[in-house]
Structure formats: C-alpha cells, structure tokens
C-alpha cells in the first residue's frame, strides 16, 4: 500500500493529527523535499551573520558574513574576522606576515614566497608581505649581463578579495 | 615534462552530479595552485577556483561557490572539481590548470573535459 | 570583480600583417596581466605573463605591453599557424576575469 505522505511536496509536511493530509509548512520553517513528516526550522542569520538567501517554504536560509568578516565552514557555519594583505589572523589577533612570507588575501595564512628555482626559473619580480614573487624565465635563456629582479609592484587595496 | 590529464567527457541528467579528474605529473603537485576554467558552448574563459594541494586551501569565484566543490589527492597528484545540481546552463568544457610559479597566472593547461548536461 | 574588455571581438589579417589586440582593466591591475592562445582544437597556451614577459619557447613575433588598465597585444608578423582565439586575464585580485576573446582569422 502506497504511504499516503509520499504524495505531499515539498513545502508541505504529512501531518499525522489531520488524516495525514498535506499541510503547508509553518512561518519560519521549511521542507525541501516530498514526503516529509515535519517541516524544519529556519536558519537565522544573526549578530555577525547577515542574510544571503531569505527561507522559503522550500528552502533553508543561507547566511554570509558583515563586512569585516568572512565565511568558514560549510555552508558558512562560521565567521572570521578579516585580516590587511600581509597579515594573518593568530590567537593574538592579525599579525604581520614574517620575512619571506605574504598574504595577498583578507583571509587566510602567510605563506612561503615561491621558490622560483624549484621550476629551474629565476625571480623575475621579489615578494613583498601583500605578494608572491613572479618567477621568470630559467637563468639560462636570460642575455648575458641582464638583471632579471624587478622591484615588487607597490601593494594596493582591494588586492585579492575575500571569497 | 609538466602535464595535466584531465578525465573523459560526461553526460548526465539535470539534477544530477559530476566529478572532473586532473592528474598532474613532471612537476611537485604539493607547490603549485591549481586553477578550474569553464568555458561554455561559444562563450569566454570563466575562472571557477583555485586550490593549493599542500593543505587544500581553496579560492571560490562567487558564482560557483554553490556549484563547485574543488579538493585535492596528494597521494595520487590529482585534483578534481565537483559540480552538483546539474543544469543545461553548466554544460562546458571545464579546464584544469596549473600556475607558472606564482598564482597570478595559469601557465599548464589540461585538454578540457566536456561535461553536457542534457534531460 | 575586475572586468576586462577586449577588442576587437574578431579580426581578420593577412599574413605578414601587425596585429594589435587591446584589452581594458576596470580598475589598476598593476601588471598582473597574461595574454592566452586557444586554438580551433581547443587547446590552451599561456604566451605572456605579466605583461610584457613571453615564455619561453614563445616566438619573438608575440610581444605584450602596458600597466595599470590599458594593454596591448601584438603580433608582429601574422603566421598563417597563428589562427586561433586570444584571451587577455587578470591574475591581480580574485576572482581571476578574463576578456571576452578575440578571433583571429586570416584572409
């Protein structure tokens, strides 16, 4: 025999105490799928989350951050404060990044500069704390007596963006 | 030589959910980003996200953060993109690439996988 | 984002010809700009990167140039194994834009 909840949609939830007809879910809760005997509540986007996708009655509410923080987590379960290019969030709050490292994100770690050498190229343009070097051609295909190093572009906001 | 195999060309439902290989070889995979690029049927180039195999940091361009999960395998130097609640608008060819020695540009490309999203 | 406006959309040359190709940044990019070949079998190659560096193994007749929001691409002199689809991109903030492409054909 056939569940007769099996017919509800989504939107709607089984309910046992009228004859399992299809009721439409309650203000502030969902069912995203058919055949459901309960709706669930609605996400809330408070204090430091902001609402991204107001709930529907067939879909949860997605919720991002305020400016100054960005999203962690799946389906951004988390916000974390935003740091400068350069620096990186520690325990202690955003810390410049250490000699040979940079951050050219508003989130995220210092990280090495790369070793251009790794690839058999050289530095083509010198890291800074806000961006990587560029690596150039290997040693061997520059003219004899050309300097290969070019002074780092100056750092610039927005940089890369949080995401 | 550095190298970036991509898997073969998909076809599945709307709805449905697809999951695009990139083998990388010649090169240490851990120290390089690499980058996904879609491109539809007559269109341009569309960054969709980077990851760094080291410790699978992930960039997402908005408009894929829904879409795209992308992750990456070090033991088999291979990095892959998922791409979930298929519709015809995501029917693409999908790159894999590789950046050049710093992140700023994407210097190996893999021969695209097609992936037709069609009822 | 960064938009990138490429010109033209397609041209047409004969070979021998200079080429130019344009491309516009919406903001300063500093010069975090790579110039692309796409050939007719959809293969992929980076020719330029930041700016004006050609990688190696690139012919001599391929050149960038430019800085801030203006660049341009040249080919010096067209090569009928030069047939194939240009994208400029911006490698300066995320998420990475590219031009719309520009078509090359030779008459």
């Known amino acids: 025999l056939q569940d007769p909840c099996s017919n509800c949609p989504a939107g709607t939830f089984c309910d046992n105490n009228r004859n399992q007809i299809c009721s439409p879910c309650p203000p502030n809760s969902f069912s995203s799928a058919g055949g459901q005997r309960t709706c669930d509540i609605c996400r809330q986007c408070k204090g430091v989350f902001r609402t991204r996708k107001e709930c529907s009655s067939t879909s949860n509410a997605e919720c991002d951050c305020t400016p100054g923080f960005h999203c962690l987590g799946a389906g951004c379960s988390m916000c974390e404060q935003d740091c400068k290019q350069g620096q990186e969030l520690t325990k202690k709050g955003c810390k410049d990044c250490c000699f040979g490292t940079f951050n050219d994100q508003k989130r995220g770690i210092c990280r090495p500069w790369t070793n251009c050498s790794l690839d058999g190229k050289s530095v083509l343009v010198n890291g800074t704390k806000e961006r990587d070097v560029v690596c150039g051609p290997s040693p061997a295909d520059l003219s004899p007596g050309a300097s290969s190093v070019t002074p780092p572009a100056p750092a610039r906001e927005p940089g890369h963006s949080p995401q | 030589q550095v190298q970036l195999v991509q898997s073969g060309a998909e076809v599945k439902k709307p709805g449905a959910s697809v999951k695009v290989s990139c083998k990388a070889s010649g090169y240490t995979f851990t120290s390089y980003w690499i980058n996904w690029v879609r491109q539809a049927p007559g269109q341009g180039l569309e960054w969709a996200g980077n990851?760094?195999?080291?410790?699978?940091?992930?960039n997402y361009n908005q408009k894929f953060k829904d879409k795209a999960t992308i992750t990456a395998d070090k033991s088999t130097s291979t990095a892959y993109m998922e791409l979930s609640s298929l519709r015809s608008e995501d029917t693409a060819v999908y790159y894999c690439?590789?950046?050049?020695?710093?992140?700023?540009?994407?210097?190996?490309w893999g021969q695209g996988t097609t992936v037709t999203v069609s009822s | 984002d960064i938009q990138m406006t490429q010109s033209p959309s397609s041209l047409s040359a004969s070979v021998g010809d200079r080429v130019t190709i344009t491309c516009q940044a919406s903001q300063d990019i500093s010069n975090y700009l790579n110039w692309y070949q796409q050939k007719p079998d959809k293969t992929v190659k980076l020719l330029i990167y930041y700016t004006t560096r050609a990688r190696s193994g690139v012919p001599s007749r391929f050149s960038g140039s430019g800085s801030g929001t203006d660049f341009t691409f040249t080919i010096s002199s067209l090569q009928p194994e030069d047939i194939a689809t240009y994208f400029c991109q911006q490698g300066d903030t995320l998420p990475y834009t590219f031009g719309q492409g520009t078509k090359l054909e030779i008459k």
């Open positions: 990851i760094y195999p080291s410790d699978s940091y992930t």
């Open positions: 690439t590789r950046d050049y020695g710093s992140a700023y540009s994407m210097s190996t």
